[in-house]
Amino acid sequence: IFKKEQAMCLEKIQRANELMGFNDSSPGCPGMWDNITCWKPAHVGEMVLVSCPELFRIFNPDQVWETETIGESDFGDSNSLDLSDMGVVSRNCTEDGWSEPFPHYFDACGFDEYESET
């Protein structure tokens, strides 16, 4: 199931790149699958928020994105995330790339990786 989530993530990143006009030489932070959840591409200065993934949720391939961005671009996301919510993890897109997640997954979500036997 997590391989499927990863594949869905890569598809969503590709669609987001098209929407945002991103390519390999674009400044900013590329979308990525960090083995827990999916992060969409972002411009430098943007903060991207994701909610803690439900461990066995199957991605809806019709949903363009499930994250909220604070910054220049906004995709009109279906769920409005806020830094004042619990169970929300953020990353900043800096000139040096993505920051570490804050809070760390284990503190925000109660887990920090999918179990190895799953």
């Epitope: 830094l83 004042s84 919510d85 619990m86 169970g87 929300v88 804050f102 809070p103 760390h104 503190d107 925000a108 109660g110 887990f111 920090d112 990786e113 179990e115 190895s116 036997e117 799953t118």
Partner: antibody, heavy 123, light 107 residues
């Protein structure tokens, strides 16, 4: 009900290793919903979280930076217990040491504690 | 590390009083905050987790509130067994850090 029973010496010489054990009853050290923590308390430093071990298909540890170079927390699945080792102790490590179970519900919290062990570091 | 401060450091109260203890975090911690009670010679006991969730078995006279950086623990109708020291603890970022404590004694 969950109970944590601590054991270990109350006096350790400077530069030696502090070793404590926490025996778990009413739960398992391999419980995939729990973490197993060590905390200490002294008049000068107050309550200080030292680290934890937990099992999620494999064993993992988190340690406080202040003791990271000196601390080891090990589980013992055969006895359902976990231990603390703190190397190269100094008198500043004198404290009451507690083990505690961590559980998750919106955040991590410590819901069951051992009775505490006063460890004095002195020659 | 996130620094936690508490006020007051001690307070005197009578049975039946309503008391409030304040905890402040040095940075934004959403509601990743726990409260513990400790009596002399004993281990801390969990009262409140996630800022306002009452731990199972804890009397409803205890309540927690707040978010961001400022939090409060309120005890309505203080009982004789409530005279103790109270600690807050942040759980958003390791190392988890505790406040210095508020000692509640009998007036």
């Amino acid at each position: 009900q969950v109970q944590l029973q601590q054991s270990g010496p109350g006096l350790v010489k400077p530069s030696q290793t502090l070793s404590l054990t926490c025996a778990i009853s009413g739960d398992s050290v391999s419980n995939k919903q729990a973490t197993w923590n060590w905390i200490r308390q002294s008049p000068s430093r107050g309550l200080e979280w030292l680290g934890r071990t937990y099992y999620r298909g494999k064993w993992k540890n988190h340690y406080a930076v202040s003791v990271k170079s000196r601390i080891t927390i090990n589980p013992d699945t055969s006895k359902s217990q976990f231990s603390l080792q703190l190397n190269s102790v100094t008198p500043e490590d004198t404290a009451v040491y507690y083990c505690a179970r961590g559980m998750w519900n919106q955040n991590w919290f410590l819901d069951h504690w051992g009775q505490g062990t006063l460890v004095t570091v002195s020659s | 590390d996130i620094q936690m401060t508490q006020s007051p450091s001690s307070l005197s109260a009578s049975v039946g009083d309503r008391i409030t203890i304040t905890c402040r975090a040095s940075q934004y911690i959403v509601r990743y905050l726990n409260w513990y009670q400790q009596k002399p010679g004993k281990a801390p006991k969990l009262l409140i987790y996630a800022a306002n969730m009452l731990q199972s078995g804890i009397p409803s006279r205890f309540s927690g509130s707040g978010s961001g950086t400022d939090f409060t623990l309120t005890i309505n109708s203080l009982q004789p067994e409530d005279f103790a020291t109270y600690f807050c603890q942040q759980a958003i970022n390791q190392p988890y850090t505790f406040g210095p404590g508020t000692k509640v004694d009998i007036k």
